[in-house]
C-alpha cells in the first residue's frame, strides 16, 4: 500500500549523511517504472533540502542533523509518477517527528531573584518563587523537566538551612525558625535548576531574601534616670529630652517612639512629645509649676512604639526628677479686679478703699503701691498701705470718664525683689448717685403763633438717677406767668408751655423753674419766638425783629 507510518528521527544525529530513513514504495512499480519525489517544508520549500528522496528507489534521505527546538515535526508529501510523468498514486502524507535529546541546560529567567519575608514567621511561610526554563521536551521526556534545589545559604545563621524550595514549582519557603532582621537582614541563596527531573544538567542563580522588620524589639530608655531643673511658672518650657534605643528599622512605625507619663503628674503639669528626627521624648511644661506649692516632681514615663508589638515585650520606664526653681514672682492683687461702691462728690481727702496685693513668694517682701491709670485724676494711693483716697470730685455724670456708673482705675504693686516685679489690679468704682443735677427742658428755643397757638411740649431731662429725677414740677418765674402757663404731664417727664395772652411778633424770654423728686431746682430761660400766624408754625413768616 502507498502509506508510511510516522517516522521518528532523533535530533542532533551524527550521520553519516545522507542518512536513509524509510523507503517509499508503490505497488504500481510491478507494472511500470516509478519515479519518486517529495514536496513540502524541509524538502522543496524552506528549509529546503533537509530531506530528499532517491528518485528510483524511493529511499527517504536525511541530509543533515535536525534540531527539535527549531522544528519538532515535518509534514511532507510523497509523490509517485510513471516514466511519462503521469501520477500513479495520490500524494502521500509523510510525518517526520524529531525526537528530543537533552541538548539544552535549564536557564533561570533572572540572574538574581529578590524576595522578602517578615522576621519571626513560622516555618512553611512562602517567600518567593524562582523560575527556570528548559527548551528541551518536558512532555514526552524528562529532558526539559526542571527540579529546583538550594545549593547554599549565606549567612548560615542561626541555622544552615533557613529555607527550602519546592522541587517542581520553585517556591522558596521558610523551613527553620529564627529569622531575625536585627541579626541577619538579608540571606543570599544559591539556587540550582537541574533538568532530567534533577538528574541532568544544572544551572545556578541567586535568590536574595530580604528579612522585613516586625516590631519585635521594645524601645529602651538610655539612660533610665534623669534630673532636670525648671523655673517656676514657665509654660511650654523644655524640661528634659529622653533618649531611647530601638533595634527595629529606623524611621519605621516599629522604631518611632510613643511616650506616656505613667505617674507623678497629678496636676497635669507636663506633656511629652516625640521628636520626629531623633525619636527623643521632649518633656515640657503644660502649666506653670509652683515652687511654693511643690518644689520637686518625680515623673515616670513609659515608652512604646507607634506600631503594636508583635509579641509580649517588657516596656521600658524612665524616672525624671524635676526640681522647681524659685523665681521672684509678681505681687498679685486680691482680687485682681475690685469693685467698690462710693458716693459721687465725696470731699477731697475722703478714703475710698484699701486695695492690696499678695506676693506668692515665701520671703516677706515689701510691696509698694501706686496708681497706674486714673483718667480723670480723681484718686491718690498710699504707697505703703494701698489706701485709695479722693483728690478730685468724683462725678458720676462725667460721660468722658464714667461708663455705666463705673469709673475704672488701674493700680500697680511692686515688690522689692531683685529684680523687682510688678503686678496690676483693676479698681472699679461704682459711683453712687447724689442729687447734684436739676431738671432741664429740651428744647430751649420755641417758635409759636400768637393766634390759636399750639401748646409747646418740652422734654425734661435730669442727669441724676432715680429717685433724683421724675416726677418733676414746673413753675414760671420773673412774671413769665402773665403770658405763659407751664404744666407737667401725668408721667411727670414733660412740661407743656402754652401762650395764654396775645403777644406781638417778637422774641421773648420765658423763665421756667423745674424741680425734681428730690426738690433740686434748676432755672432755665426758654427763648420763645412769637409769630404773627395761626396754629402751628416752625419759622415766622416775613421779617421779624428781636427784642
Amino acid at each position: 500500500d502507498w502509506v508510511v507510518a510516522p517516522i521518528s528521527v532523533p535530533e542532533n544525529g551524527k550521520g553519516p549523511f545522507p542518512q536513509r530513513l524509510n523507503q517509499l514504495k508503490s505497488n504500481k512499480d510491478r507494472d511500470t517504472k516509478i519515479f519518486y519525489s517529495i514536496t513540502g517544508p524541509g524538502a522543496d520549500s524552506p528549509p529546503e533540502g533537509v530531506f530528499a528522496v532517491e528518485k528510483e528507489t524511493g529511499w527517504l534521505l536525511l541530509n543533515k542533523p535536525l534540531d527539535r527546538e527549531e522544528i519538532a515535526k515535518y509534514e511532507l508529501f510523497g509523490h509517485a509518477v510513471s516514466e511519462n510523468g503521469a501520477s500513479v498514486e495520490d500524494p502521500m502524507n509523510i510525518s517526520i517527528i524529531v525526537t528530543d535529546q537533552n541538548d539544552h541546560k535549564p536557564k533561570f529567567t533572572q540572574d538574581t531573584f529578590r524576595g522578602s519575608v517578615l522576621e519571626g514567621v513560622l516555618p512553611g511561610t512562602s517567600v518567593m518563587q524562582v523560575t527556570a526554563t528548559d527548551e528541551d521536551d518536558a512532555i514526552y521526556t524528562y529532558n526539559g523537566v526542571v527540579a529546583y534545589s538550594i545549593h547554599s545559604q549565606e549567612p548560615k545563621d542561626p541555622h544552615d538551612l533557613m529555607f527550602t524550595i519546592h522541587r517542581s514549582t520553585g517556591t522558596i519557603s521558610v523551613i527553620s525558625s529564627g529569622l531575625d532582621r536585627e541579626k541577619v537582614p538579608e540571606y543570599t541563596l544559591t539556587i540550582q535548576a537541574t533538568d532530567m527531573d534533577g538528574d541532568g544538567s544544572t544551572t545556578t542563580a541567586v535568590a536574595v531574601v530580604e528579612i522585613l522588620d516586625a516590631n519585635d524589639n521594645a524601645p529602651m530608655f538610655d539612660p533610665q534616670k534623669y534630673e532636670a531643673h525648671v523655673p517656676e511658672n514657665a509654660v511650654g518650657h523644655e524640661v528634659q529630652r529622653l533618649t531611647v534605643t530601638d533595634l527595629d528599622a529606623p524611621n519605621s512605625p516599629a522604631w518611632r517612639a510613643t511616650y506616656l507619663i505613667m505617674g507623678g503628674d497629678d496636676g497635669d503639669h507636663f506633656t511629652i512629645t516625640t521628636h520626629p528626627e531623633s525619636n527623643q521624648g521632649i518633656l515640657t511644661t503644660r502649666k506653670g509649676l509652683d515652687f511654693e506649692a511643690k518644689n520637686q516632681h518625680t515623673l515616670y514615663v513609659e515608652v512604646t512604639n507607634e506600631a503594636p508589638f508583635v509579641l509580649k515585650l517588657p516596656t521600658s520606664t524612665a524616672t525624671i526628677v524635676v526640681h522647681v526653681e524659685d523665681v521672684n514672682e509678681a505681687p498679685v492683687f486680691v482680687p485682681p479686679s475690685k469693685v467698690v461702691e462710693v458716693q459721687e462728690g465725696i470731699p477731697t481727702g475722703e478714703p475710698v478703699c484699701v486695695y492690696t496685693a499678695e506676693d506668692p513668694d515665701k520671703e516677706n517682701q515689701k510691696i509698694s503701691y501706686r496708681i497706674l491709670r486714673d483718667p480723670a485724676g480723681w484718686l491718690a494711693m498710699d504707697p505703703d498701705s494701698g489706701q485709695v483716697t479722693a483728690v478730685g470730685t468724683l462725678d458720676r455724670e462725667d460721660e468722658q470718664f464714667v461708663r455705666n456708673n463705673i469709673y475704672e482705675v488701674m493700680v500697680l504693686a511692686m515688690d522689692n525683689g531683685s529684680p523687682p516685679t510688678t503686678g496690676t489690679g483693676t479698681l472699679l468704682l461704682t459711683l453712687i448717685d447724689v442729687n447734684d443735677h436739676g431738671p432741664v427742658p429740651e428744647p430751649r428755643q420755641i417758635t409759636i403763633c400768637n393766634q390759636s397757638p399750639v401748646r409747646q411740649v418740652l422734654n425734661i431731662t435730669d442727669k441724676d438717677l432715680s429717685p433724683h429725677t421724675s416726677p418733676f414740677q414746673a413753675q414760671l418765674t420773673d412774671d413769665s406767668d402773665i403770658y405763659w402757663t407751664a404744666e407737667v404731664n401725668e408721667e411727670g417727664d414733660t412740661v407743656v408751655l402754652s401762650l395764654k395772652k396775645f403777644l406781638k411778633q417778637d422774641t421773648y424770654d420765658v423763665h421756667l423753674s423745674l424741680s425734681d423728686h428730690g426738690n433740686k431746682e434748676q432755672l432755665t430761660v426758654i427763648r420763645a419766638t412769637v409769630c404773627d400766624c395761626h396754629g402751628h408754625v416752625e419759622t415766622c413768616p416775613g421779617p421779624w425783629k428781636g427784642g
Epitope: 522576621e119 519571626g120 514567621v121 513560622l122 516555618p123 512553611g124 512562602s126 542561626p158 541555622h159 538551612l161 533557613m162 527550602t164 519546592h166 522541587r167 517542581s168 514549582t169 517556591t171 519557603s173 523551613i175 527553620s176 525558625s177 529564627g178 531575625d180 516586625a214 519585635d216 508583635v310 509579641l311 509580649k312
Partner: antibody
Framework: EVQLLESGGGLVQPGGSLRLSCAAS????????MSWVRQAPGKGLEWVSA????????YYADSVKGRFTISRDNSKNTLYLQMNSLRAEDTAVYYC??????????WGQGTMVTVSS | QSALTQPASVSGSPGQSITISCTGT?????????VSWYQQHPGKAPKLILS???KRPSGVSNRFSGSKSGNTASLSISGLQAEDEADYYC???????????FGGGTKLTVL
C-alpha cells in the same frame, strides 16, 4: 544534653482549663519553633499548635482554635499551652517538640490530659 | 484521615527485612526532601530515627534506612529485632500551615 520536660497535665472536667508547661534545656531555645503534638489513646499523632522562635507567630489546628493559646518565655526557656473550654475529645498525651528545620527533635516525655466528668 | 498514607500494620520475623511506605503528594513528599520517620514504643514519646529521607541521627542503628521515589517515601528495617516492635510515623514538610504532615502510623510486629 538536649531535653524537653512537660508538666501540668491532669484530670479536668469538660469546660475546664489547664495550663501545660514545657521546660527546655541544652539548646538555644529562642532559635527554634516549638510545637505541641497530642496523641489520643490508641490513635496517631495530631499536631495541635506551634509558635515561632521569637513568639511573634503562632499556629493552631482547627480543632483547638479559639480555645487553646500557645506562648513562650524565652528568658525562662519555657513553652506553654493554655487550654480552655476543654472537651472529652481533647483527652490525650500532650508532647512538646522542637522543630529542627525539617523534623521534630527532641520530643518531651509527654503529659496526660484527661477530660471527664 | 491522615495527610500521609501508611499501612496500618506490617510484620516480619527476626532477621528479616521489612519496608513501610508513606505516600503523599507532589506538594509534600514529592516536593521536598524533608521526610522524617519516628519510632514510638508503647507508653513512650516518639523518637526521630530518620530525617531528610535517609539521614540517621547519631545513636540510631544502621539497620534503619530510608528512600523516596516520586510522592512515596519508604522506611526499611533490615535484620529485624524484637526491640524494633513499635509504631512508626512518617512526616513531611509542606509549604503553608500546618507546615508538617503526619502519617497515620504503622504498627510493626516482630513475629
Amino acid at each position: 544534653e538536649v531535653q524537653l520536660l512537660e508538666s501540668g497535665g491532669g484530670l479536668v472536667q469538660p469546660g475546664g482549663s489547664l495550663r501545660l508547661s514545657c521546660a527546655a534545656s541544652g539548646f538555644t531555645f529562642s532559635s527554634y519553633a516549638m510545637s505541641w503534638v497530642r496523641q489520643a489513646p490508641g490513635k496517631g499523632l495530631e499536631w495541635v499548635s506551634a509558635i515561632s522562635g521569637s513568639g511573634g507567630s503562632t499556629y493552631y489546628a482547627d480543632s483547638v482554635k479559639g480555645r487553646f493559646t500557645i506562648s513562650r518565655d524565652n528568658s525562662k526557656n519555657t513553652l506553654y499551652l493554655q487550654m480552655n473550654s476543654l472537651r472529652a475529645e481533647d483527652t490525650a498525651v500532650y508532647y512538646c517538640a522542637s522543630w529542627g528545620g525539617g523534623w521534630f527533635d527532641p520530643w518531651g516525655q509527654g503529659t496526660m490530659v484527661t477530660v471527664s466528668s | 484521615q491522615s495527610a500521609l498514607t501508611q499501612p496500618a500494620s506490617v510484620s516480619g520475623s527476626p532477621g528479616q527485612s521489612i519496608t513501610i511506605s508513606c505516600t503523599g503528594t507532589s506538594n509534600d513528599v514529592g516536593a521536598y526532601n524533608y521526610v522524617s520517620w519516628y519510632q514510638q514504643h508503647p507508653g513512650k514519646a516518639p523518637k526521630l530515627i530518620l530525617s531528610e529521607v535517609n539521614k540517621r541521627p547519631s545513636g540510631v542503628s544502621n539497620r534503619f534506612s530510608g528512600s523516596k521515589s516520586g510522592n512515596t517515601a519508604s522506611l526499611s528495617i533490615s535484620g529485624l529485632q524484637a526491640e524494633d516492635e513499635a509504631d512508626y510515623y512518617c512526616s513531611s514538610f509542606t509549604s503553608g500551615l500546618p507546615w508538617v504532615l503526619f502519617g497515620g502510623g504503622t504498627k510493626l510486629t516482630v513475629l
